[in-house]
């Protein structure tokens, strides 16, 4: 677990958290067939996704130098997602079953960002979008995004993580 | 490649009950839910519920009116599907069902369905 | 609870038609549709989930369409082994419900 200081966290621990939220992303929306919801309208509510850009200290020099600026922003998007999933966006029609993998992704976000946050100290979350599509169509249609969202930047967490582990664990 | 196997077919009187079972291999019984669909004699399909054995938590069909009950063995990893106050309309082919692991409810694998008989 | 509203009820087609069933959800499900086949004396089995993504195995004759409300299974060349009962099936929302059926046979 990261404490106050700036220490690094458990690098493996994330790692194993971070592939296992890569795997789960990636059963939670796999590849649909031609989506006929893709031309009912386009919000704009994946725009304001957290991603991991250049300016985020998550490139292998960055990480070296301080890694608390990448690892908050990573900590940022964790919690960003995790609300988004456990929203009306995910639990109101189309229902998904309790054995749903978006129920385990939820939980491993979570896990994965506590892990991250410092002991006593609150990192700054992101404010998510207020969102209550009333119709099924525009629900589906959010979580695909969502969720294709996700899987991008939990591919690049994945990759953070692997890198911290490989070269800045103690 | 998840496999179901239910019981056999049942002859039943009006008023009474009847427990069919759903035994499941070849996947993680705990990790899916199970469900129930009947087929009346030249009918169509009708879901009555399922069971998801990780927490014992049923869903059902309001529609029958309290008198289905759904249960699972996880030692046996087998589900059991109850109705009671039959009538002759109950007489059906009862399947038990396994859906995607996607999370939503279309159902890939089916049992052979059990024959329920209700009459006098 | 959402109603399927299939049509035809039953149908007759000859080998090599263009055969399409429809269902009609009484609101919005918006693709969360299934199409089963059952042959007589048979358990159903999945053919298209999504109401377009056929399922592993399912041969290409067999398409989906729709979204919302409106919803088609189309057999662009029927073959003789496509005779059976075709139902609709929504998991958008509890209780889940399907079509009445459509029983295909061959002219």
């Known amino acids: 677990r990261a404490v106050p200081g700036g220490s690094s966290p458990a690098w493996t621990q994330c790692q194993q958290l971070s592939q296992k939220l890569c795997t789960l992303a990636w059963s939670a929306h796999p590849l649909v067939g031609h989506m006929d919801l893709r031309e009912e309208g386009d919000e704009e509510t994946t725009n304001d996704v957290p991603h991991i850009q250049c300016g985020d200290g998550c490139d292998p020099q960055g990480l070296r130098d301080n890694s608390q600026f990448c690892l908050q922003r990573i900590h940022q998007g964790l919690i960003f997602y995790e609300k988004l999933l456990g929203s009306d966006i995910f639990t109101g029609e189309p229902s998904l079953l309790p054995d749903s993998p978006v129920g385990q992704l939820h939980a491993s976000l979570l896990g994965l960002s506590q892990l991250l946050q410092p002991e006593g100290h609150h990192w700054e979350t992101q404010q998510i979008p207020s969102l209550s599509p009333s119709q099924p169509w525009q629900r589906l249609l959010l979580r695909f995004k969502i969720l294709r969202s996700l899987q991008a930047f939990v591919a690049v967490a994945a990759r953070v993580f692997a890198h911290g582990a490989a070269t800045l664990s103690p | 490649q998840v496999q179901l196997v239910q019981s056999g077919a049942e002859v039943k009187k009006p008023g009474s009950s009847v427990k069919t079972s759903c035994k499941a291999s070849?996947?993680?019984?705990?990790?899916?839910?199970i469900h129930w669909v009947r087929q009346r004699p030249g009918q169509g399909l009708e879901w009555m519920g399922y069971?998801?054995?990780?927490?014992?938590?049923?869903k059902y069909n309001e529609n029958f009116k309290g008198r289905v009950t759904i249960t699972a063995d996880k030692s046996t990893s087998t589900a059991y599907m109850e109705l009671s106050s039959l009538r002759s309309e109950d007489t059906a082919v009862y399947y038990c069902?396994?859906?995607?692991?996607?999370?939503?409810?279309?159902?890939?694998?089916w049992g052979q369905g059990t024959l329920v008989t209700v009459s006098s | 609870d959402i109603q399927m509203t299939q049509s035809p009820s039953s149908l007759s087609a000859s080998v090599g038609d263009r055969v399409t069933i429809t269902c009609k959800a009484s609101?919005?499900?918006?693709?969360?549709v299934a199409w089963y086949q059952q042959k007589p004396g048979k358990v159903p089995k999945l053919l298209l989930y999504?109401?377009?993504t056929r399922h592993t195995g399912v041969p290409s004759r067999f398409s989906g369409s729709g979204s919302r409300t409106d919803f088609t299974l189309t057999i662009s060349s029927l073959q003789p082994e496509d005779v059976a009962t075709y139902y609709c099936?929504?998991?958008?929302?509890?209780?889940?419900?399907f079509g009445s059926g459509t029983k295909l046979e061959i002219k």
């Open positions: 099936h929504q998991y958008s929302s509890y209780p889940f419900t």
């Open positions: 609101r919005d499900v918006a693709i969360a």
């Open positions: 069902a396994i859906p995607d692991r996607s999370g939503y409810a279309w159902f890939i694998y």
């Open positions: 069971i998801y054995p990780r927490d014992d938590s049923p």
């Open positions: 070849g996947g993680t019984f705990t990790d899916q839910t």
């Open positions: 999504w109401a377009s």
